[in-house]
Structure formats: structure tokens, C-alpha cells
Interface confidence: low
């Protein structure tokens, strides 16, 4: 077994079970789960005298690790004294020590209630420049408590010296305040007040509530597509307001940034829908760097007929990152559709869910309308997946039988893209960007006269090219012929194709 340091636990009795006239009392320290032997247990008894006894180590059956208990018996004024047991495990490291400081006995206690309160918005539904969160820890038996603030589960740097404790009768209450910038609050992070008391943890969490809408009107704010962000390097975000009743009075869409920095000029579009409602979109160019660094953008929608402003905010998704895996496939030929094939691309296990999918042919990006891509869906694990489907024609694959499915995602290293190549006829042109590739100059077509291949694009046939038996030195099924140019004095050019 490999070296394992011990876990150390204090062993105490309940105070109510110790007679009030007891002149001596025993407490203990358990060191468990360590390997190899030995551990050294020492006690700091302050001003009191004590005798110690360390029991022989026992082996934990399942793991083969060891456990031992050290007992300390003290006499005298033990009730107010704190004791420290020090456990050293030199096999872990020459300076590996764990100290546990505790009193002789544990009292029954009333656990705290933990509640977070937050400062309110102003009357117009705006958040002030800073937001205060107040953690109320109430109704606990007086004793040491530790308060920690977490942001999305990560410990925050907070000055806890401002925490104040009051006692009401038998119970105590403590409060701690956290001040957040508007930017942090609007970024949709979760804030947790975590309280440690008597070895137990109690907590409460809060985050900005989802905005509620005036009835019938909805507003949506998109994040920039990874394609715009990383490839075009000109990201935009769009604020979309739907189901507005066309009426007198202008819909105002106002953009702002949580940092207070100025925003770019936005473009606006209004469309009347068939059902008579109005859709308004406003598109705002954002700085690539600003977005990547976590700037928060807000869109505020006002209209004379809205009871109050609608506010929407967006920022870079927080949380873990994982690069996409990309797999590309070609469906086999289907009876009755020899001149069309479907290519499929599975992109999976990426985080966060923002992704752009492109198809390329002949190094040219195909229009988005050519392919159909699903919305990201959760996998069984923690990531997301999408499928993308592309229909290709014989003319395309005969021109060049390599189609590329490319995913653009922030976690893809190093250039935010991952791509896979796929061929309609695998083995003819290689199925990935790494495979060997024949030059694309001449293609042999099926049904043509032997020895007279037709050049790509219908141009004049190449004079010194014949269709012969499958070549063993070219990757691909042996039943497929290859075209070999018989150029004198040179290594022959090789093309793959149907003969």
C-alpha cells in the first residue's frame, strides 16, 4: 500500500454524563487510516498533570491501513481547560503533524439557522452599483462559529472582522455582510454563506432571481456565437423582444455594461409578425477581450405600455471547461438515392454549451442553411452534445471527396477549433485530415473507356493516365482501381477514383 497520512478525531464524552464531582476524566484522540506505522501522539495539557496511554495500532480490515487511539486522563480543574493532541506521521513527511484542540466534554447544543438576506433594487428595477448580502446565523448555543462566503463554490476573500455576535438569553446570533459589485451579482453566480459550528456545516445560498416579465412580453439576450468570437473576432449579442402589441409609443432598448464603460453603437430591427405582434431586435457589437474577461452586458427594454422596464443581462458562462470530441460519419448508399448522401457529425462532452458547427468542402465553408444542427443537449455526464447533418451531392464528392465538420468552442486548444474530415467513399480519399491524400487533379469515372480518364470538371482528359489494377501501396479497398500517370523518368502521380 502507498503512504497515507492519518485522519485525526477528538474523542470526548457528553458533559451531562460526567458527574459534577468527578476529580479526574479521560479524553482521547483517534488517528485512523494511516500507512505505514508508526504515528506519534503527544498531548499538551496546559497547566494540568495528566497520564497518557496509547493503545496498540489495529489494522483496518478493508484497506490494510492502521488506526490507533491515545487516551489522556487528567485531574484537577479540567472543566475550563483546552487540550491539544498532536499526531505526527513521519512516513508521510518529516514535518507532517495534525493538531486537534478540544475540551474534555461536548455539550448538547442548539444548531444555528442560516439565512441570507439581500439589499433591494431601487424603484425602477435597477440594481445599485453594489449589492449587500447579509448572512444571519441565529438561535445557536453560544460557542465558536466560523463563517465563510463562497462564490460558485469557491472560497471568497472577505473581511470577516465586520461580523457581529449578539446573545439573547441562552442563544446567540451572528451576522456577516458581503458587499458585491453589480457586475458580480448580475453574472448569475451563486453566493453561499457557510457556517461551521461544533464540527457541523450549515449554509444558505442565493443568486440573482430570474427576471419576471410583464405579461405577454418576453425579452431574450443571446451570447455571442463561438464562431463570431474566436474565428471572425467580431462578436455580437442580440436583445430580442417578442409579443409586443403594436401601438403608439416607441420601444426603447438601451445597452449598458456592468463595468460602466461605454458600449458600441447597436443596430435595431423591427418586424411585424403574422399574428399581429411586433418583434424588436437590437444587436450590439462587443469587444472580444471584454467578453472573454467576463464583462456583463445589460439590455433594458422600456415602452409606455409596459408597467416597468424589462432587464436582461448576459456574460461569459462560468464553470468548468471541456473541449468537444468530434466524430464524423457518412451514411451508406440508399436505394434510389445514388446521387445524394447524408453526412453526420457528433460533437460531444463539451462544456459550456456554447458551440458553433461548420461544414467545409474544398476548404470553403458551406452556408449554414446547408446543414441542420441540433440544440446542445446534456449528456449523461456533465457535458453537452449536438448532432449536425449535411446532405451532399455526387457532383460535390466527385469534385473532392472530403468534407470537414468543424466545432468552434472556447475550450478547444489551442485555436478554439476541433475538426474531423469524412468521405462519402472512405478509403478513396482518406477519412481524416491526417490520412494520406492523393492529388486532386484527375478523377477516373465509372463506365469510361479504359485508358481514357476524364479530368475533373469535364476538361480535356489527361493523356498519360490509365486505369489499372488496385495498387497495394495506396490505402483503400483493393477492388477500387487507381489512376497512375505514366510519366517517364519520374515517380508516377497517383489518383484515387472509380474506374
Amino acid at each position: 500500500a502507498s503512504t497515507q497520512s492519518p485522519s485525526v478525531f477528538p474523542l470526548t464524552r457528553c458533559c451531562k454524563n460526567i458527574p459534577s464531582n468527578a476529580t479526574s476524566v479521560t479524553l482521547g484522540c483517534l488517528a485512523t487510516g494511516y500507512f505505514p506505522e508508526p504515528v506519534m501522539v503527544t498531548w499538551d495539557t496546559g497547566s494540568l498533570n495528566g497520564t497518557t496511554m496509547t493503545l496498540p495500532a489495529t489494522t483496518l480490515t478493508l484497506s490494510g491501513h492502521y488506526a490507533t487511539i491515545s487516551l489522556l486522563t487528567v485531574s484537577g480543574a479540567w472543566a475550563k481547560q483546552m487540550f491539544t493532541c498532536r499526531v505526527a506521521h513521519t512516513p508521510s513527511s518529516t514535518d507532517w503533524v495534525d493538531n486537534k484542540t478540544f475540551s474534555v466534554c461536548s455539550r448538547d447544543f442548539t444548531p444555528p439557522t442560516v439565512k441570507i438576506l439581500q439589499s433591494s433594487c431601487d424603484g425602477g428595477g435597477h440594481f445599485p452599483p453594489t449589492i449587500q448580502l447579509l448572512c444571519l446565523v441565529s438561535g445557536y448555543t453560544p460557542g465558536t462559529i466560523n463563517i465563510t462566503w463562497l462564490e460558485d463554490g469557491q472560497v471568497m476573500d472577505v473581511d470577516l472582522s465586520t461580523a457581529s455576535t449578539t446573545q439573547e438569553g441562552e442563544l446567540a446570533s451572528t451576522q456577516s455582510e458581503l458587499t458585491l459589485s453589480q457586475k458580480h451579482w448580475l453574472s448569475d453566480r451563486t453566493y453561499t454563506c457557510q457556517v461551521t459550528y461544533q464540527g457541523h456545516t450549515f449554509e444558505d445560498s442565493t443568486k440573482k432571481c430570474a427576471d419576471s416579465n410583464p405579461r405577454g412580453v418576453s425579452a431574450y439576450l443571446s451570447r455571442p456565437s463561438p464562431f463570431d468570437l474566436f474565428i471572425r473576432k467580431s462578436p455580437t449579442i442580440t436583445c430580442l423582444v417578442v409579443d409586443l402589441a403594436p401601438s403608439k409609443g416607441t420601444v426603447n432598448l438601451t445597452w449598458s455594461r456592468a463595468s460602466g464603460k461605454p458600449v458600441n453603437h447597436s443596430t435595431r430591427k423591427e418586424e411585424k409578425q403574422r399574428n399581429g405582434t411586433l418583434t424588436v431586435t437590437s444587436t450590439l457589437p462587443v469587444g472580444t477581450r471584454d467578453w472573454i474577461e467576463g464583462e456583463t452586458y445589460q439590455c433594458r427594454v422600456t415602452h409606455p405600455h409596459l408597467p416597468r422596464a424589462l432587464m436582461r443581462s448576459t456574460t461569459k458562462t462560468s464553470g468548468p471547461r471541456a473541449a468537444p470530441e468530434v466524430y464524423a460519419f457518412a451514411t451508406p448508399e440508399w436505394p434510389g438515392s445514388r446521387d445524394k448522401r447524408t453526412l453526420a457529425c457528433l460533437i460531444q462532452n463539451f462544456m459550456p454549451e456554447d458551440i458553433s458547427v461548420q461544414w467545409l468542402h474544398n476548404e470553403v465553408q458551406l452556408p449554414d442553411a446547408r446543414h441542420s444542427t441540433t440544440q446542445p443537449r446534456k449528456t449523461k455526464g456533465s457535458g453537452f452534445f449536438v448532432f449536425s447533418r449535411l446532405e451532399v451531392t455526387r457532383a460535390e464528392w466527385e469534385q473532392k471527396d472530403e468534407f470537414i465538420c468543424r466545432a468552434v468552442h472556447e475550450a478547444a486548444s489551442p485555436s478554439q477549433t476541433v475538426q474531423r474530415a469524412v468521405s462519402v467513399n472512405p478509403g478513396l480519399a482518406g477519412g481524416s485530415a491526417q490520412s494520406q491524400r492523393a492529388p486532386d487533379r484527375v478523377l477516373c469515372h465509372s463506365g469510361q473507356q479504359q485508358g481514357l480518364p476524364r479530368a475533373a470538371g469535364g476538361s480535356v482528359p489527361h493523356p498519360r493516365c490509365h486505369c489499372g489494377a488496385g495498387r497495394a501501396d495506396w490505402p483503400g479497398p483493393p477492388e477500387l482501381d487507381v489512376c497512375v500517370e505514366e510519366a517517364e523518368g519520374e515517380a508516377p502521380w497517383t489518383w484515387t477514383g472509380l474506374c
Epitope: 452599483p129 453594489t130 476573500d157 472577505v158 473581511d159 458587499t179 458585491l180 459589485s181 457586475k183 458580480h184 456592468a258 463595468s259 460602466g260 474577461e293 467576463g294 471547461r321 486548444s413 489551442p414
Partner: antibody, heavy 118, light 106 residues
């Protein structure tokens, strides 16, 4: 763009206190994230000293905790470094640095050289 | 303290070459590593953060990667202006820097 400019005495005697000022333009120090002090010793080694964040919370390098203090004056958009009981070991170029995410350092001042000598 | 070790104090290369500068963390620091470039007489400039994210405005010849506790800054085609000292920095627990690797161009 954020710009940071350090100013300080240049020469300090051993055992005295060192005070440096960083004046920030182009961005409010109460807007967000962390305003750091980092020093670079003559051999080029970089050492993070501490920061004060947008809400005034400070965090220091544990090796200096007993003698460092970082404060700010929001009305002047400045933050300060005070280092007590300096020795020749504190001779270095001191940079004030803006960290846009409390994790790394985006904008650095040009640095101010400090010599501790009697 | 987490120690970031840059084993090469100096690296010599030529314009157009591919060069990799390495840094090893004394413990697992996840992807919490940044790279800085300091040209003679200038302040350090952020190149890469979170192990592989290129900072805005940084040329795409600079890439960062991670393998366990080993971190690499690669310059795919060195330019004359890349003459500088390169530092790694961990931001997993407080902040510590590597000792720097000076890139010399022949």
C-alpha cells in the same frame, strides 16, 4: 484603457517604512477585481505582495503579512503599499498591477525602483 | 507555497523556429497557470491564462498547453521581437511565479 503609474521615494534607509502610491487612470478602482503590488528583484525573480480588491478587501503574501499594508483613496483613484522594517532584501522594482479576475495580471505599471541602503 | 520551476534559464533559437518553454508546478494546480512576456526595459505582459487561453491581442503563434503538472508555452514561429524573458505563474492558491526563461535569438 487602464493605466497605472507608481510613485515613491526611490531610496529608503534600512529599518524604515516604505510607502508607494499607484495612481490609476481610465478605470475606477471600485469598479471590479483586484489591484495588486508585485515586485521584481535584481535577479528578475517576481514576487506577488498583495492586493486590495474593488470592495476594499485586502489579501497579502503570507511571507510579508506582519509588515505589509495595502490601502486606497477612492476619491483620488489611488491605492498604496506600505512595507515596514525594510532591509536591503527589499531592494527591487515595484509594480502596481490590475488583475481583471483576481487570478492573473492584465495591466502593469511601468515600475518604480526602490533601493534600501544607509 | 506552490513552487513553479522553469528548468531552462536560457533558450537559444532562430527566427522562424518553433520553441517550447516549460514550467513544472510542485503540486496539482489544475489549469490555473498564466504566462507572461517581459521584454528588456519593459513591464511583463500577459500572454496566456488558464493554461491555454490566449489573451486578447496576443499573436496566435503563442499557444499554451498542459500535461499533468507540466505547462508549456510554445511559439510556433519565433520572430525577432519575441526576444524576452518568459515567466509562468500559478493562480491556484495565491500567486507564485517561475524564475523565468530568457529567449535568445541567434
Amino acid at each position: 484603457d487602464v493605466q497605472l503609474l507608481e510613485s515613491g521615494p526611490g531610496l529608503v534607509k534600512p529599518s524604515q517604512s516604505l510607502s508607494l502610491t499607484c495612481t490609476v487612470t481610465g478605470y475606477s478602482i471600485t469598479s471590479d477585481y483586484a489591484w495588486n503590488w508585485i515586485r521584481q528583484f535584481p535577479g528578475n525573480k517576481l514576487e506577488w505582495l498583495g492586493y486590495i480588491n474593488y470592495s476594499g478587501t485586502t489579501r497579502y503574501n503570507p511571507s510579508l503579512k506582519s509588515r505589509i499594508s495595502i490601502s486606497r483613496d477612492t476619491s483620488k483613484n489611488q491605492f498604496f503599499l506600505q512595507l515596514n522594517s525594510v532591509t536591503s532584501e527589499d531592494t527591487a522594482t515595484y509594480f502596481c498591477v490590475y488583475g481583471s479576475s483576481q487570478r492573473f495580471f492584465d495591466y502593469w505599471g511601468q515600475g518604480t525602483t526602490l533601493t534600501v541602503s544607509s | 507555497d506552490i513552487v513553479m520551476t522553469q528548468s531552462h534559464k536560457f533558450m537559444s533559437t532562430s527566427v522562424g523556429d518553433r520553441v517550447s518553454i516549460t514550467c513544472k508546478a510542485s503540486q496539482d494546480v489544475s489549469i490555473d497557470v498564466a504566462w507572461y512576456q517581459q521584454k528588456p526595459g519593459q513591464s511583463p505582459k500577459l500572454l496566456i491564462y488558464s493554461a491555454s487561453w490566449r489573451y486578447a491581442g496576443v499573436p496566435d503563434r503563442f499557444t499554451g498547453s498542459r500535461s499533468g503538472t507540466d505547462y508549456t508555452l510554445t511559439i510556433s514561429s519565433v520572430q525577432a521581437e519575441d526576444l524576452a524573458v518568459y515567466y509562468c505563474q500559478q493562480h491556484y492558491n495565491l500567486f507564485t511565479f517561475g524564475s523565468g526563461t530568457k529567449l535568445e535569438i541567434q
